[in-house]
Interface confidence: low
Amino acid sequence: MSLQRIVRVSLEHPTSAVCVAGVETLVDIYGSVPEGTEMFEVYGTPGVDIYISPNMERGRERADTRRWRFDATLEIIVVMNSPSNDLNDSHVQISYHSSHEPLPLAYAVLYLTCVDISLDCDLNCEGRQDRNFVDKRQWVWGPSGYGGILLVNCDRDDPSCDVQDNCDQHVHCLQDLEDMSVMVLRTQGPAALFDDHKLVLHTSSYDAKRAQVFHICGPEDVCEAYRHVLGQDKVSYEVPRLHGDEERFFVEGLSFPDAGFTGLISFHVTLLDDSNEDFSASPIFTDTVVFRVAPWIMTPSTLPPLEVYVCRVRNNTCFVDAVAELARKAGCKLTICPQAENRNDRWIQDEMELGYVQAPHKTLPVVFDSPRNGELQDFPYKRILGPDFGYVTREPRDRSVSGLDSFGNLEVSPPVVANGKEYPLGRILIGGNLPGSSGRRVTQVVRDFLHAQKVQPPVELFVDWLAVGHVDEFLSFVPAPDGKGFRMLLASPGACFKLFQEKQKCGHGRALLFQGVVDDEQVKTISINQVLSNKDLINYNKFVQSCIDWNREVLKRELGLAECDIIDIPQLFKTERKKATAFFPDLVNMLVLGKHLGIPKPFGPIINGCCCLEEKVRSLLEPLGLHCTFIDDFTPYHMLHGEVHCGTNVCRKPFSFKWWNMVP
């Protein structure tokens, strides 16, 4: 960025100036003018381009084409495009003329030294624009956008360290550098110029809190060579020219986008003239590079699974075995959190959300640790944070959280187009209350964080009718082999009553729910006839259906869904303390591993040797090429108001779509 530098020439002695390649310098010839001057001529040595700009209306002209009428509105513009080999090796000569004199009245000479300076992010951002054609002070979204990308260096590459990599001002291991973005300062010009000029790398104190910079000052394979030069308390750094014409810096993010932080960070290099001992150094030129901190991105259940997490607790051996078998079928890794670490807190879905951050050079999985802080609260930090697995959390200052702050209440849709707008990374779905009402909501700090990521704009659904209050209690997504690529599953009391009425008409009214449940206390069976004659249950489920229908309309509108994109899964709810819980295991609360679904075993009415609820679900999902495995979670999960999805978590493959190519 030019500071619109103006150089004043003198008749008494030649003037020297430094100019930057490609940057215009204005030459002021009006400071000392011989008496009687009516015209002037301007010439430059080869490599110096000189233009005259008569006024705003008329474009600039090359100066060496003719003699110019002396007029204080004229601007003389000098540009050099390649760096000098030596100090003052180019010059501009101005001659002042009168119509009465054949020879020039006087000469002024301006000696020029050209230096080329650029500060760039290492633009291996696939397809992002070449720096010569863009305003580097901007960061632009989209396939033809430009600007650098920074990762929050929130993993722990050195297992011997206690903290995340960006928590101090050191590079502890070389692997750490892979999580950083490269920034290059290139300078070309006579070395002698830097005897009385200096280069300063600088940023604002605001940005210094959000990113930090290391300068490589020694052998690349030695950690100590990476000197911390900007960030935290450091806002400027005089750059020693250690490696001739190119200095390399490594930049890491310290903070994710959040309330009050857009994610944009600027670094500047300024060339300062320090030749005059009586004055402070004066700026000649500043170049800027802008980075955007990569957002944390959630992965929908339709993306391929990489790793499944489950807790082993006192009474869930069969459940863990079933999940292990499903993971094996789906070809993904299984991690079991032992009882010593979970202390019988089995709700691993509620404790954390597994997502990722991405730059062109690196993709890093990142766990978002919920503020719920049950007995599993140490698991994400102690067991998931590690080499190439980052960690982030948000907790309200007053520590006040509700059940809605558990991450069973944080989901994301597959990619959608809604109201003409593309959401190539889907939209985050969180549960809250009806607009304008004062019930439970996700804590503000989590909502702020999710909104600030920008790439998956959140939709708030109504969940306060549920006792636990999580979106995964009535909603899930499964992959589908067609253009849409997915179906949304919604829990449906209406569909369940319809199914039971059909079975009753066919003479199966005495078929029993909950037959075969293995539990310490015998679970009471109930027949289809009893369900359909229970007025309270029917009325309550009408209310539940209206709550789900409210969400259905929101989801259709905000995700651009048609009725054919939605599958109604039969489900009944019961009331506890005026809020809803699943009457039988909640079928939509399922584990989706590619085409393999781990669905809570509903223990529905057995008709002709088959559970009619399982049969119905199979008939709805198997035509999509999905394989349904019904997992008995009744005692260890369902009785505690959760199901298969609540008790598992999945790390998934990132989107192939690159977030910087979208336009939020």
Epitope: R314, N344, D345, E375, S400, M639
Partner: antibody
Framework: EVQLLESGAEVKKPGSSVKVSCKSS????????VVWVRQAPGQGPEWMGG????????HYAQKFQGRVTITADEDTSTAYMELNSLRSDDTAVYYC????????????WGQGTLVTVSS | EIVLTQSPATLSLSPGQRATLSCGAS???????LAWYQQKPGLAPRLLIY???IRATGIPDRFRGSGSGTDFTLTISGLEPEDFAVYYC??????????FGGGTKVEIK
């Protein structure tokens, strides 16, 4: 409805310990949290801590951290509260109560155990 | 921790009158996790209202809880002789820093 039966009144010397028991009947012990609340003469109730028997993990109010131990025995459906290093200002009625899992909200209360600390 | 301040300390009313008891919190009680208890001499507290406004099982509808954030109210619409007791408010939003108010005594005038 859950019934809670607490152990009998105790008189203790300063510096000693007391262990109060609370036996539950009429409901599934595992399905609730058990909380302990004390009430000094003429004062409002004071929440001491609680335990979810299913998770077997106690939670303590900061004030009592290090001095109180709350345990639960699933086999006998009994919860226990032990308070150490007793002082005269620990003289109070100690109540146990059942609570819903997801919040520590005392719902059904025991009859209370009077603990008197006096030299 | 959240401090709960109840007012007035004592309320002298006649049977049939309306009683209005206040409970102020030093900071917002999230999710309105506030309860009201009634306690008679020598007995354990009895849960009347939870989640600020939901009546517990078996509680007559003359007891009504309202409010949100930092200001909560218990209203007894027509006092019956058995309603004269001490009433405590209780917040359970910030475990394990759970607190009770100092109480309001409702006595016969």
């Amino acid at each position: 409805e859950v019934q809670l039966l607490e152990s009998g009144a105790e008189v203790k010397k300063p510096g000693s310990s007391v262990k109060v028991s609370c036996k539950s009947s009429g409901g599934t012990f595992n399905n609730y949290a058990v909380v302990w609340v004390r009430q000094a003469p003429g004062q409002g109730p004071e929440w001491m801590g609680g335990i979810i028997p299913m998770f077997d993990t106690p939670h303590y109010a900061q004030k009592f951290q290090g001095r109180v131990t709350i345990t639960a025995d699933e086999d006998t459906s009994t919860a226990y509260m032990e308070l150490n290093s007793l002082r005269s200002d620990d003289t109070a009625v100690y109540y146990c109560a059942t609570s819903y899992f997801r919040q520590w909200l005392p719902r059904d209360w025991g009859q209370g155990t009077l603990v008197t600390v006096s030299s | 921790e959240i401090v709960l301040t109840q007012s007035p300390a004592t309320l002298s009313l006649s049977p049939g009158q309306r009683a209005t008891l206040s409970c102020g919190a030093s900071q917002s009680v999230s999710s309105n996790y506030l309860a009201w208890y009634q306690q008679k001499p020598g007995l354990a507290p009895r849960l009347l209202i939870y989640d600020a406004s939901i009546r517990a099982t078996g509680i007559p509808d003359r007891f009504r809880g309202s409010g949100s954030g930092t200001d909560f109210t218990l209203t007894i619409s027509g006092l019956e002789p058995e309603d004269f007791a001490v009433y405590y408010c209780h917040q359970y939003a910030t475990a394990p820093q759970i607190t009770f108010g100092g109480g309001t005594k409702v006595e016969i005038k």
